[in-house]
Interface confidence: low
C-alpha cells in the first residue's frame, strides 16, 4: 500500500488553528512533474457535503513530501469531506477524511466503518441535540432511508446495511428532517472487495493475519497498519509519537499525536493515533487498552504492564504478547495495588495465580485487615492461570486498609498486598442554585457542597411541580456543567433536589434537601399574519394564520382573535388555547356585518404584536318567515295556499319557496318556487286524491329566509292518480272569485 497519511488537527476551539496535512513516505513524493511523480493534492471535496462559500483555503507545501491546508474561518468550513491524493501511476491513491461538527444534532459513534464483503454494516448516529423529527439517511448525497424519531435506540439512530458489497462504499449521512445538513452525522463506509481474511482477484488468497488492528488490503494482501505500528503484519509498535510505514514520521507539537486524526489508504480509513481515543482524539486510553482508538486490549499477565502505545511490557523472566510465558513458582497475577468500594456494598474480589503445580481453589485465600480469612466461593481454571472469586460480606468503614491475597502450593507461595478504600456515597448538604429562568425552562447549578466522598461521577436532578404527587422527573447531568430543565409549565413552582453518585456499584447517595424554583412567563414576540379566511355561513367564519419560523421553542400559550364591528362599536374576542393551532372557526357572528379581524399570540396574560388587520364582510341573512299560512283543498288534485307577507323586510322579496311533502311519507320533499313575490296565494295542482299533505314556505331576498309554520290539508274525493304537484299563482282575490 502507498505510504500516505492525511492528518487532521482536531483542536477545535478556534477554527483558524485547524489544519489538514498530507504526508507521503513514498520516494520523491510531492515534487511535481519535474521529479519522480505527480504532486500531492489536498482539497475539500464539495460533491457530497456542500458548505457556504467562504474565503479560499490556503495550501502550503512543506518540503517534498508534505502539503498543508489552512485558512478555515468558521466551524462550518470544517464540515465535510477532504481528500489527499498521492503516489504515481497505478499506485496513485486517494485518502479521505470526513469531518463532523462537534455541535451537530447527530454525531457518529464511529466515523469510519471498514467491513468485509457480505458483512452487515451498522452505522450508529448518536443524538447530541434532540429534534423530534424524522432522521433522513443519505448515501453519497442521495436519499436512502428514513427513521422515525421514536425508532431511536438508547439515544441512537441505527442504519443496518446487510450483505454489503463494494459499491455500497461511500459517504453516509444522518440528518434530522428539515434541519441544516451541517448538523448531520457523516460516516465513511469502506467495503473490502473480499470476505474476511481473503484477498486477490477471486478472493482466493489468504491474508497474513494483520495484528494490532491492521487491515488486509483486498488487492495486494498487504497489511495497512494503524498509525504507530509497523512490520509486514503490523507486529511492531513505533516509539510514542511516531507514524508512517517505517515509523519515520514524527507527530507535530509538544503533546505528540494528541488531537490528531490519521487517515490512511483504504481499506483502513481513519482513526486516532496510537494511545489516543475519543471524537477529537484528545483522550488517553483507559487502563488496559492501547493502540489506535485504544481499540486493543493488553490483557497482560504475570505482572506485565500495559503501555497505551505499544501494549504489554513484561517484567524480567516473562515474555509473550500478554507476558503469558513464565517461570513455574506460584505467582499472583494482575492484582491491583489499590481497590475502591462503596460503603455497604458486597463486592466480588478476584485473585488470579499461576504456577506449577497449578493452583486450585483451596490454595488461594483472601485476608482482611482484621485478620479474617475469606475462602473463595468459585474458581475459574484456565490453561495459564486460576482465578479465585471471593464474595465479600457487606463492607463497613473498618474494612478500609491493607488486604492480602495469598497462594500456596507445593511449589512455594506468593502473596500480594493491596489497599482497599471504603468510600461513603456523597449526600448534598444544600439545595441546587437557580441561575436563570424562562417560561418553560430553568437553568440550575447542580453542584453543591456534600458530605461523604468524591469524586462525583453523576449528578441526578429530580424535579416535579410543587405540591404534586406525580413521579419525580429525573435528569442525569455532567457534574461540571449547569443543567437546563426543559419542557416545564410556565409560571409554575417546581421542587428540585439533587442526588449525587460516586464511581462504582452502590455509589448513589441519598437525595439532598429540596428547593422551590418557579418558571417565568416572558412576553411573546412573534407577530402572526392572517393567511386567509372563508365564510362558512351567514354567521360563521373560518380563519387561518401563520407564524414566522424562528429558532428555539415557541413562546406562547395560544392565540387571541379579535373582530371589530365598527358600525355597532363592538369587539368580539375568541381565545384559541393551543399554540400549535393555525386555524379557528368563529361562530355566532352578525350576518351582513363588516368586521375588522386580527390575531395575536398570547403567553400567560401577555399579548404579542397583532397581525396586520383584515377586513371581512359577512353575507346578510334571509328575511323573516311568511305569516298566517293557510291551506284549503279545492278538488281531488288541488290545494290552495294563502299567506301574508313577512314583516320588517330588509329589502324587496325576490321569490317564495313552497315545500310540499306527503304526511308520513319517507320520500324527499318537493320545493316549488313562487316567482311573483307580490302574490299572497298560490294553487298547488297535480296532487293525489284523498291524500294528506304538509306545506311550509319561506321568502328569499339575497338569501333564503326562515320557514313558516307547517300546515296540513287533504285533497278531496277518489280521483285518478296525478302525475305530481305543480303550482299556479294568482292574486288572492282572483283565485277566490273563481
Amino acid at each position: 500500500a502507498v505510504d500516505l497519511t492525511l492528518l487532521a488537527n482536531l483542536r477545535l476551539t478556534d477554527p483558524q488553528r485547524f489544519f489538514l496535512t498530507c504526508v507521503s513516505g513514498e520516494a520523491g513524493a510531492g515534487r511535481g512533474s519535474d521529479a519522480w511523480g505527480p504532486p500531492l493534492l489536498l482539497e475539500k471535496d464539495d460533491r457530497i457535503v456542500r458548505t457556504p462559500p467562504g474565503p479560499p483555503l490556503r495550501l502550503a507545501r512543506n518540503g517534498s513530501h508534505q502539503v498543508t491546508l489552512r485558512g478555515f474561518s468558521k466551524p462550518s468550513d470544517l464540515v465535510g469531506v477532504f481528500s489527499c491524493v498521492g503516489g504515481a501511476g497505478a499506485r496513485r491513491t486517494r485518502v479521505i477524511y470526513v469531518h463532523n461538527s462537534p455541535g451537530a444534532h447527530l454525531l457518529p459513534d464511529k466515523v469510519t466503518h471498514t467491513v468485509n464483503k457480505g458483512d452487515t454494516a451498522v452505522l450508529s448516529a448518536r443524538v447530541h441535540k434532540e429534534k423530534q423529527t424524522d432522521v433522513i439517511w443519505k448515501s453519497n448525497g442521495s436519499y436512502f432511508y428514513t427513521l422515525d424519531w421514536h425508532e431511536a435506540q438508547d439515544g441512537r439512530f441505527l442504519l443496518q446495511l446487510p450483505n454489503v458489497q463494494p459499491p455500497s462504499s461511500g459517504i453516509y449521512s444522518a440528518t434530522y428532517l428539515e434541519a441544516s445538513p451541517l448538523g448531520s452525522a457523516f460516516f465513511r463506509l469502506i467495503v473490502r472487495g473480499c470476505g474476511a481474511g481473503r484477498w486477490g482477484p477471486g478472493c482466493t488468497k489468504e491474508c497474513p493475519g494483520c495484528l494490532h488492528g491492521g487491515v488486509c488490503h483486498d488487492h495486494d494482501g498487504e497489511c495497512v497498519c494503524p498509525p504507530g505500528f509497523t512490520g509486514t503484519r503490523c507486529e511492531q509498535a513505533c516509539r510514542e509519537g511516531r507514524f508512517g510505514q517505517s515509523c519515520q514520521e514524527q507527530c507535530p507539537g509538544i503533546s505528540g499525536c494528541r488531537g490528531l486524526t490519521f487517515c490512511l489508504p483504504d481499506p483502513y480509513g481513519c482513526s486516532c493515533g496510537s494511545g489516543w481515543r475519543g471524537s477529537q482524539c484528545q483522550e488517553a486510553c483507559a487502563p488496559g487498552h492501547f493502540g489506535a482508538d485504544c481499540r486493543l486490549q493488553c490483557q497482560c499477565q504475570n505482572g506485565g504492564t500495559c503501555d497505551r502505545f505499544s501494549g504489554c511490557v513484561c517484567p524480567s523472566g516473562w515474555h509473550g504478547v500478554h507476558c503469558e510465558k513464565s517461570d513455574r513458582i506460584p505467582q499472583i497475577l494482575n492484582m491491583a495495588s489499590e481497590l475502591e468500594f462503596n460503603l455497604e456494598t458486597m463486592p466480588r474480589i478476584n485473585c488470579a495465580a499461576a504456577g506449577n503445580p497449578f493452583p486450585v481453589r483451596g490454595s488461594i485465600e483472601l485476608r482482611k485487615p482484621d485478620g479474617t480469612v475469606l475462602l473463595s466461593t468459585k474458581a475459574i481454571v484456565e490453561p495459564e492461570k486460576t482465578t479465585a472469586e471471593f464474595e465479600v460480606p457487606r463492607l463497613v468503614l473498618a474494612d478500609s486498609g491493607f488486604w492480602e491475597c495469598r497462594v500456596s502450593t507445593s511449589g512455594g507461595q506468593d502473596s500480594r498486598r493491596f489497599k482497599v478504600n471504603v468510600k461513603v456515597p456523597p449526600v448534598p448538604l444544600a439545595a441546587p442554585r437557580l441561575l436563570t429562568k424562562q417560561s418553560r425552562q430553568l437553568v440550575v447549578s447542580p453542584l453543591v457542597s456534600f458530605s461523604g466522598d468524591g469524586p462525583i461521577s453523576t449528578v441526578r436532578l429530580h424535579y416535579r411541580p410543587q405540591d404534586s404527587t406525580m413521579d419525580w422527573s429525573t435528569i442525569v447531568v455532567d457534574p461540571s456543567e449547569n443543567v437546563t430543565l426543559m419542557n416545564l409549565r410556565p409560571k409554575t413552582g417546581y421542587s428540585v433536589r439533587v442526588q449525587l453518585s460516586r464511581p462504582g456499584e452502590g455509589g448513589e447517595g441519598a437525595w439532598g434537601p429540596p428547593t422551590l424554583m418557579t418558571t417565568d412567563c416572558p412576553e411573546p414576540l412573534l407577530q402572526p399574519w392572517l393567511e386567509g379566511w372563508h365564510v362558512e355561513g351567514t354567521d360563521r367564519l373560518r380563519v387561518s394564520w401563520s407564524l414566522p419560523l424562528v429558532p428555539g421553542p415557541l413562546v406562547g400559550d395560544g392565540f387571541l382573535l379579535r373582530l371589530w364591528d365598527g358600525t355597532r362599536g363592538q369587539e368580539r374576542r375568541e381565545n384559541v388555547s393551543s399554540p400549535q393551532a393555525r386555524t379557528a372557526l368563529l361562530t355566532g357572528l352578525t350576518p351582513g356585518t363588516h368586521y375588522q379581524l386580527d390575531v395575536q399570540l398570547y403567553h400567560c396574560t401577555l399579548l404579542g404584536p397583532a397581525s396586520p388587520p383584515a377586513h371581512v364582510l359577512l353575507p346578510p341573512s334571509g328575511p323573516p318567515a311568511p305569516r298566517h299560512l293557510h291551506a284549503q283543498a279545492l278538488s281531488d288534485s288541488e290545494i290552495q295556499l294563502t299567506w301574508k307577507h313577512p314583516e320588517a323586510l330588509p329589502g324587496p322579496i325576490s321569490k317564495y319557496v313552497v315545500e310540499v311533502q306527503v304526511a308520513g311519507g319517507a320520500g324527499d320533499p318537493l320545493w316549488i318556487d313562487v316567482d311573483r313575490p307580490e302574490e299572497t296565494s298560490t294553487i298547488i295542482r297535480g296532487l293525489n286524491a284523498s291524500t294528506r299533505y304538509l306545506f311550509r314556505m319561506r321568502a328569499s331576498i339575497q338569501g333564503l329566509g326562515d320557514w313558516s309554520n307547517t300546515v296540513e290539508e287533504s285533497t278531496l274525493g277518489n280521483g285518478l292518480q296525478a302525475e305530481g304537484p305543480v303550482q299556479e299563482s294568482r292574486a288572492a282575490e282572483e283565485g277566490l272569485d273563481q
Partner: antibody, heavy 123, light 109 residues
C-alpha cells in the same frame, strides 16, 4: 369543507392487484401529510402507509412493505395506494386520512393525529 | 416498535355515568404524543384528543385526556347515548408511523 373520498375498492383474488384513490377537497392538499389506515372486519385500526407533502418521503407498515406503494398527485389533489400481491389478510375497509401536522417552532414537525377521514372503501 | 395496550376490552355503563378508559405504551411516549379516537358503528373514526390532553375542534368538554410517559387515560364525565362506541388510542411521532391500541368497546349496560 374538508372532504376525503376513497374509491377503487372491490373483490380481488389472492395474488391480485388493486389501486385505491382518495380525492381530497376543501384544503391545500399539497401542504399535508396523508396516510392510509385499514380496519379488518370486526377488528381494530391498523396504520398502513404515509406520505409527506412533496411525495418524496414515504413510510410503510411491516405487514405491507414491498407489496404496497403510496403516492400522490398534488396537481390532482389525489392520494393513491397501489396494492400488489394481495393476501386474504389484506381484506379490510381502507380509510385515507389527513394528518393534523404542525411545526412547534424549533422542535421539528409533529403529527398529532388524523383530523379528517374518508368514509372508507372495502377491499 | 411501541405497542399500545388498551383496557378494559369492553366497558359496560349506563348513560349519565362516568367512563374511564386506559391506554398503556410499551415504551415511554415522547412529548405526550398520544391521540384518542371515537368510532361509531359503520362510521370512520373521529379525532377526540391529541397531545394526550388537548381536545380536537368541536369535541364536547365532557371528554378529557390525561397521562404522560407510558400511561394515559380518556375520561367521559357524563355518558350521553351517542358516546357508546369503540375508542382507540394512538401513539404518533414526527413521522407518519402510527401505533393504534386494540380498542375499548363502550357499551350500554
Amino acid at each position: 369543507e374538508v372532504q376525503l373520498l376513497e374509491s377503487g375498492g372491490g373483490l380481488v383474488q389472492p395474488g391480485g392487484s388493486l389501486r385505491l384513490s382518495c380525492a381530497a377537497s376543501g384544503f391545500t392538499f399539497s401542504n399535508y401529510v396523508m396516510v392510509w389506515v385499514r380496519q379488518a372486519p370486526g377488528k381494530g385500526l391498523e396504520w398502513v402507509s404515509g406520505i409527506y407533502p412533496s411525495g418524496g418521503h414515504t413510510k410503510y407498515a411491516d405487514s405491507v412493505k414491498g407489496r404496497f406503494t403510496i403516492s400522490r398527485d398534488n396537481s390532482k389533489n389525489t392520494l393513491y395506494l397501489q396494492m400488489n400481491s394481495l393476501r386474504a389478510e389484506d381484506t379490510a375497509v381502507y380509510y385515507c386520512a389527513r394528518v393534523n401536522y404542525y411545526d412547534s417552532s424549533g422542535y421539528g414537525p409533529i403529527a398529532p393525529g388524523l383530523d379528517y377521514w374518508g368514509q372508507g372503501t372495502l377491499v | 416498535d411501541i405497542q399500545m395496550t388498551q383496557s378494559p376490552g369492553t366497558l359496560s355503563l349506563s348513560p349519565g355515568e362516568r367512563a374511564t378508559l386506559f391506554c398503556r405504551a410499551s415504551q415511554r411516549v415522547t412529548s405526550n404524543s398520544l391521540a384518542w379516537y371515537q368510532q361509531r358503528p359503520g362510521q370512520a373514526p373521529r379525532l377526540l384528543i391529541y397531545d394526550a390532553s388537548t381536545r380536537a375542534t368541536g369535541i364536547p368538554d365532557r371528554f378529557s385526556g390525561s397521562g404522560s410517559g407510558r400511561d394515559f387515560t380518556l375520561t367521559i364525565s357524563r355518558l350521553e347515548p351517542e358516546d357508546f362506541a369503540v375508542y382507540y388510542c394512538q401513539r404518533y411521532g414526527s413521522s407518519v408511523l402510527y401505533s393504534f391500541g386494540q380498542g375499548t368497546k363502550l357499551e350500554i349496560t
